[in-house]
Interface confidence: low
């Protein structure tokens, strides 16, 4: 499995590394996690792509002034947005 | 609770061939590689190969003692993890275990283990 | 290949000892090791993995450590129960296996 990886960048075009998965890793994994409140003051983005053995959460988490969204995909540099 | 029951060990000749089953239960087998490791009698671990999941193509991977000679498949509507062993040798004869990590709790090593089916090569 | 070699092969000791096992790879492997406890007729148990995590419902006295090239496992107060063979696994590049540490009660 190969998954595109970065961390903590503010933009998908720092994000386009593919990186070739361990033999454990059936996951790419994509972690975007925003801080502001509603949709009226944005504190900072940020992105983070991996390969992952597992899908980590399946669904997205709202909390409070922060929200992440974690997506899972399993082909060939699927991770691409 | 998850079990590991491998079947179809036995008595071959050299140069003859054998497959051996798993039937999995208690997880989610789709999602999850499945692997052989061996055991010859008196001695240690051999891992043997795997096979990963179907959005990977169902990827395999062999120690080099059993490339050529072996084959892993799955049929996941059924559960079950296969291994094919051809132009079987008398040092292949030891006890195999099909074995499985446990994803769920951040474990991706062997987690869960069959019971083993012993085959011996012999004339 | 990846090579484990593991030492010793085999040890006695006393009920409360502290018992220490050592496994060295061939090249670096991270913390990319799993310990396996195994005894006899019966399939190994994952005892720790990733060098220095306790597997669920493994008791406490057991731990690990290490990276890289250079880890030890250990029991910190040898019980009856823990005669076994152990052995250590490295899952950086396929799975390699030590040759096994057998642990006897003197």
């Known amino acids: 499995l190969m998954c595109f990886s970065c961390l903590n960048q503010k933009s998908n075009l720092y994000c386009l590394k593919p990186t070739i998965c361990s033999d454990q890793d059936n996951y790419c994994v994509t972690v975007s996690a925003s801080a502001g409140i509603g949709n009226l003051v944005t504190f900072g983005h940020s992105l983070s792509k991996t390969c992952s053995p597992a899908c980590p959460i399946p669904e997205g988490v709202n909390v409070g002034v922060a929200s992440m969204g974690i997506s899972c995909c399993q082909s060939f540099l699927c991770n691409f947005s | 609770e998850v079990q590991l029951v491998e079947s179809g060990g036995g008595l071959v000749q050299p140069g003859g061939s054998l497959k051996l089953s798993c039937a999995a239960s208690?997880?989610?087998?789709?999602?999850?590689?499945m692997h052989w490791v061996r055991q010859a009698s008196g001695k240690g671990l051999e891992w043997v190969g795997r096979?990963?999941?179907?959005?990977?193509?169902?990827?395999?991977y062999y120690a080099d003692s059993v490339k050529g000679r072996f084959t892993i498949s799955r049929d996941d509507s059924k559960s079950t993890v296969y291994l094919q062993m051809n132009s079987l040798k008398t040092e292949d004869t030891a006890v195999y275990y099909c074995?499985?990590?446990?994803?769920?709790?951040?474990?991706?090593?062997?987690?869960?283990w069959g019971q083993g089916t012993l085959v011996t090569v012999s004339s | 290949d990846i090579q484990m070699t593991q030492s010793p092969s085999s040890l006695s000791a006393s009920v409360g000892d502290r018992v220490t096992i050592t496994c060295k790879a061939s090249?670096?492997?991270?913390?990319?090791v799993d310990w396996y406890q195994q005894k006899p007729g019966k399939a190994p148990k994952l005892l720790i993995y990733?060098?220095?995590n306790r597997y669920t419902g493994v008791p406490s006295r057991f731990s690990g450590s290490g990276s890289g090239t250079d880890f030890t496992f250990t029991i910190s107060s040898l019980q009856p129960e823990d005669i076994a063979t152990y052995y250590c696994?490295?899952?950086?590049?396929?799975?390699?296996f030590g040759q096994g540490t057998k642990v006897e009660i003197k």
């Open positions: 074995s499985a990590p446990n994803y769920y709790d951040g474990t991706y090593s062997f987690a869960y």
């Open positions: 208690g997880f989610t087998f789709s999602t999850v590689a």
């Open positions: 096979i990963r999941t179907k959005p990977v193509n169902y990827e395999t």
């Open positions: 090249q670096n492997v991270g913390s990319n």
């Open positions: 990733k060098a220095s």
């Open positions: 696994m490295q899952s950086e590049t396929k799975y390699t």
